[in-house]
């Protein structure tokens, strides 16, 4: 494939990747899985100034992040390390907590109304939001 | 009232170490990113180091990077910069500042300051 | 690193003048600017942020303005107490950067 140069209609810009920001809610697994039928993957935050610009498209609005330990560790969908990498929990979190009553903890990392994220239920239908970077090859057939 | 209070100054040895504390009061201390930042004497506000609430995050001004370790105690409302291979050039006055949470908002800098805590390194 | 101008470095100005001072950064910071009023001996104080938020309890003679690279801090009427030395701070991405400072003294 060619190499991506600018963002798709729709997408914002920042920093050398494109974002797409959901105005609908989904399952975690259906959030990822829309998100890689685009060529892209869920957002992967590695910096404060990332989480900052995130943080300030999507509002104060539960939104989830390509963040999972549904296989044990936490992981980023795209690989980044999470033990190094940047992290932005809410005070007593991730708790994996069983309370809620719908079976099983919570595997599944979301922004919070304030911005900190929080572990949840990954069936809840929060809204999402995408990331691809634009130096990596597209899978779309270069144009002749 | 919101408070910080800075102790632990004085004068050291170039090469020796030192550790400054703040002490917080007046807000849920756990629940902000807290900061270092100095002033040498004669010179402008050098912003030094950073800790998130939980204490996952660390970053560090180049400066000081490898010789300075901020850390936080949230059971004791305290903010620590250890701070060791002193240089003459880590003498000033420093402050610690707490990050702002507005609104349940994140990122607009640094809204609460203490007074500062001088250090002196000297042979 | 992001780094911060500001000017002048230096200014005197009577009590009653307007004063203006910039901030420039050396990429996009989008708002994350503050401005800082330092005195001997006193702990710092914020005056704006978020470029052109005035912070509580701070006289509206102080006011920001800008985006993106240049920033402006604006005394409408300068009195006594306003004699200090002022800092913008990016905010944007670490490491955390001030400009150099703008020192305001009596003409």
């Known amino acids: 494939g060619s190499e991506r140069t600018c963002c798709p209609v729709n997408w914002v810009e920042h920093e050398r990747s494109c974002y797409w920001f959901s105005r609908s809610g989904k399952a975690w697994a259906d959030a990822d899985n829309y998100c890689r039928l685009e060529d892209a993957h869920l957002v992967v935050v590695t910096s404060w100034e990332e989480q900052k610009f995130v943080q300030h498209h999507i509002g104060p609005v539960n939104t989830w992040m390509g963040l999972h330990d549904q296989n044990g560790p936490w992981k980023w969908v795209d690989g980044t390390d999470y033990e190094t990498g940047f992290k932005n929990w809410r005070p007593e979190q991730p708790d994996d907590w069983y309370g809620h009553g719908l079976g099983g903890g919570e595997d599944c990392a979301h922004f919070t109304d304030d911005g900190r994220w929080n572990d949840d239920v990954c069936q809840r239908p929060y809204r999402w939001v995408c990331e691809t970077e634009l130096d990596k090859a597209s899978q779309e057939p270069p144009l002749l | 009232q919101v408070q910080l209070v800075e102790s632990g100054g004085g004068v050291v040895q170039p090469g020796r170490s030192l550790r400054l504390s703040c002490a917080a009061s007046?807000?849920?201390?756990?629940?902000?990113?807290m900061h270092w930042v100095r002033q040498a004497p004669g010179r402008g506000l050098e912003w030094v180091a950073v800790?998130?609430?939980?204490?996952?995050?660390?970053y560090y001004a180049d400066s000081v990077k490898g010789r300075f370790t901020i850390s936080r105690d949230n059971s004791k409302n305290t903010l620590y910069l250890e701070m060791n291979s002193l240089r003459v050039e880590d003498t000033a006055v420093y402050y610690c500042a707490r990050e702002e949470y507005s609104s349940g908002w994140f990122g607009y800098g640094m809204d609460v300051w203490g007074q500062g805590t001088t250090v002196t390194v000297s042979s | 690193d992001i780094q911060m101008t500001q000017s002048p470095s230096s200014l005197s100005a009577s009590v009653g003048d307007r004063v203006t001072i910039t901030c420039r950064a050396s990429q996009g910071i989008r708002n994350d600017l503050g401005w800082y009023q330092l005195k001997p001996g006193k702990a710092p104080k914020r005056l704006i942020y978020?470029?052109?938020s005035l912070q509580s309890g701070v006289p509206s003679r102080f006011s920001g303005s800008g985006s993106g690279p240049e920033f402006t801090l604006t005394i409408s009427s300068l009195q006594p107490e306003d004699f200090a030395t002022y800092y913008c701070l990016q905010h944007y991405s670490f490491p955390f950067t001030f400009g150099p400072g703008t020192k305001v003294d009596i003409k």
């Open positions: 800790i998130w609430y939980d204490g996952s995050n660390k």
């Open positions: 007046g807000f849920t201390f756990s629940s902000f990113i």
């Open positions: 978020a470029a052109s």
